[in-house]
């Protein structure tokens, strides 16, 4: 058993000597990036107070190709790097075109609305003259690909214009349009080269060891790691904690169950029901407020104020009033709960799903025309299942190495 | 040229609902540069501004009688509407019904700049 | 109770000139344009003048309107009989989040 321990330790290290250092470095495992967008069926009778009504449409799947650059190795056993991120469009794994149309929530006119609530009637009524002069709407009917990628709108110029420095668009605004051919921060971690214990735990992210996004020093931390490589020789109860750009915050997965993947065995980590509860619910959370029901997280903070929110697909594990509010949204256990499935003694992911639900908080706003008579609700705009399973050669080699090798080494 | 033209009930009793219609005719009331208003004066006073409301349904309503008001559009009849609840002696007014320009740049001049000719309310029992 | 503050009356002779005040606060006239309405006895009022000096078409140009600070006027030169009316001056009043009127000026000519 030592012997196999340092064979592992020896192999796992980021370290250009070890065996998983290209895999951590390249990330071997072919990414998919599965998008589901919610298109509504009564954007007209929504501006008349009715209840939104969504169908899902998708998936719509990307290749997602990763690779690390700028890797400097510091002399506090820590390594920084940059992750890059493409995406390519999989027809064949598709259900649609991305020159399909979708009727979304423009959200820039409902997310700046919702902004605008408290300000002066005045600024309010120069909102509607704006949204008027640029022949903005409620609701607007794009193509998958603009959605994804970018659109031209002038009142991106506009926010640019009035407000610079608010806004991470140019003159495209797209939701996936900042995570295309652009990295994710710079994230500093430990290499695992003097300390295991430490491997792969983020020290920084942009230089900063916490965030200031939320109200709490708790909900500030970055913790865990970047999440795509654990510490090794994991037990159950172990956690699968790890700093998400997107989310703006860290999260902590929980043991499961164990299981087998290719012959490799494997814990199976999911969201805990805490992870998007509202701090009556779940007091640490109290940090991520101020919050609506429980199930969904409050962006806004880190998603240029906009009243943008992350919850499980459908709003699963969500106060149920969520879901009742929208005609079309079927939550379900199995197809819409995230796993990450870890070989416990490597803490290298095997086989992942990271599912989770953008949506927009949308109400009607006194002086701003274009709302009409919308009753507030949290309406999903889309969800996105990011998966991988290790495969081919990968797989084989990891095998061989790490499963079967110690084997043979145990005998 | 624009005109509008009330109608309504010219007698309301106390503690009911008074409704009254506005009809545009000459232009569209789903013009996106104009809210529709309400303004009202009692016999001898002032103007009193009560409220506006855009094509969409949106609204906006003078706080002192927020509480007391709704106003609607019915985009299909070019109309839009006023109702007060809870009505008592002093909403005995003439009621004009208004489009409200929402004119200039940044700052923003509301202006009423078509109105109807009004319509006698009194509230009695 | 009106927070844009006009004098109840104002007269002068054919021809002459004739300044109506309207007297506000920051929160309105110090901040927002003001408008002027004119109602000719037993009609609905019309927009005489808008954004502080906009005169609408058709409205003659003895009609003429200023601001400064937190105060506006209304100036009539050339005093008509026809001038004969109520005067209102409005504004947006961001404290109270309403569309005010002044209290109303009737011009006589005498």
């Known amino acids: 058993p030592s012997l196999i321990k340092q064979q592992v330790l020896k192999n796992v290290r980021i370290d250009p000597s070890s065996l998983s250092f290209n895999m951590w470095k390249e990330i071997p495992i072919p990414f998919y990036l599965s998008v589901y967008f919610f298109d509504v069926m009564n954007p007209s009778e929504i501006l008349k107070g009715e209840k939104p009504q969504v169908r899902e449409r998708g998936p719509y799947v990307y290749r997602e190709f990763r690779h690390k650059s700028n890797i400097t190795f510091n002399n506090n056993d820590t390594v920084s790097f940059l992750e890059y991120r493409t995406f390519q469009f999989q027809p064949s794994k598709s259900h649609g075109s991305e020159s399909d149309y979708i009727v979304m929530p423009n959200i820039l006119v409902l997310g700046a609305a919702v902004m605008m609530e408290n300000k002066p009637m005045t600024l309010k009524l120069i909102m509607t003259l704006a949204f008027t002069t640029l022949g903005e709407r409620a609701f607007m009917n794009r193509t998958v690909g603009e959605i994804m990628w970018g659109y031209k709108d002038p009142l991106v110029n506009l926010i640019n214009k009035y407000f610079p420095g608010m806004f991470p668009f140019k003159d495209k605004f797209g939701l996936f349009a900042e995570l295309n051919n652009s990295d994710s921060g710079l994230f500093t971690v430990f290499t695992g080269v003097q300390n295991i214990s430490r491997i792969h735990l983020v020290d920084k992210w942009n230089g900063l060891s916490k965030v200031d996004f939320w109200h709490s020093d708790q909900c500030n931390m970055i913790n865990g790691t970047s999440g795509q490589m654990w510490p090794p020789f994991m037990t159950p109860e172990s956690s699968l904690e790890f700093y998400s750009p997107e989310a703006c915050r860290s999260m902590k997965l929980m043991y499961k169950e164990s299981g087998v993947f290719e012959g490799i065995p494997t814990y199976r980590f999911v969201a805990p029901k805490t992870l998007f509860a509202n701090g009556s619910i779940y007091p640490p959370n109290e940090g991520f407020c101020p919050c609506l029901e429980s199930g969904i997280q409050n962006v806004s903070t880190c998603r240029f104020s906009a009243p943008l929110f992350l919850s499980h697909p459908h709003f699963l594990n969500a106060d149920p009033v969520l879901a009742e509010a929208v005609t079309g949204l079927h939550p379900n256990q199995e197809a819409h709960s995230l796993f990450l499935d870890i070989h416990p003694v490597t803490g290298i992911p095997m086989n992942c799903s990271v599912k989770l639900q953008l949506s927009l908080y949308m109400k009607s706003v006194a002086g701003i025309g274009q709302t009409g008579k919308i009753e507030p609700v949290v309406l999903p705009l889309l969800w996105f299942a990011e998966s991988g399973a290790m495969e081919g050669e990968t797989l084989h080699t990891f095998y061989t190495q790490l499963v079967l090798m110690p084997k043979v080494m145990h005998y | 040229q624009v005109q509008l033209q009330e109608s309504g009930p010219g007698l309301v009793k106390p503690s009911e609902t008074l409704s009254l219609n506005c009809t545009v005719s000459g232009g569209s009331i789903s013009s996106s540069s104009y809210y529709w208003g309400w303004i009202r004066q009692p016999p001898g006073k002032g103007l009193e501004w009560i409220g506006s409301?855009?094509?969409?349904?949106?609204?906006y309503y003078n706080p002192s009688l927020k509480s007391r008001v709704t106003m609607s559009v019915d985009t299909s009849k070019n109309q839009f509407s006023l109702k007060l609840n809870s009505v008592t002696a002093a909403d005995t007014a003439v009621y004009y019904c208004a489009r409200h320009v929402l004119g200039g740049g940044w700052e923003v001049s509301q202006r009423f700049d078509y109105w109807g000719r009004g319509t006698l309310v009194t509230v009695s029992s | 109770q009106s927070v844009l503050t006009q004098p109840p009356s104002a007269s002068g002779t054919p021809g002459q000139r004739v300044t109506i005040s309207c007297s506000g606060s920051?929160?309105?006239?110090?901040?927002?344009?003001v408008n002027w309405y004119q109602q000719l006895p037993g009609t609905a009022p019309k927009l005489l003048i808008h954004?502080?000096?906009q005169r609408p078409s058709g409205v003659p140009d003895r009609f003429s309107g200023s601001k400064s600070g937190t105060s506006a006027s209304l100036a009539i030169s050339g005093l008509l009989s026809e001038d004969e009316a109520d005067y209102y001056c409005a504004a947006w009043d961001d404290s109270l989040n309403a569309y005010v009127f002044g209290t109303g000026t009737k011009v006589t000519v005498l």
């Open positions: 409301v855009y094509y969409t349904g949106n609204t």
């Open positions: 920051s929160s309105n006239i110090g901040s927002n344009p």
């Open positions: 954004t502080n000096n």
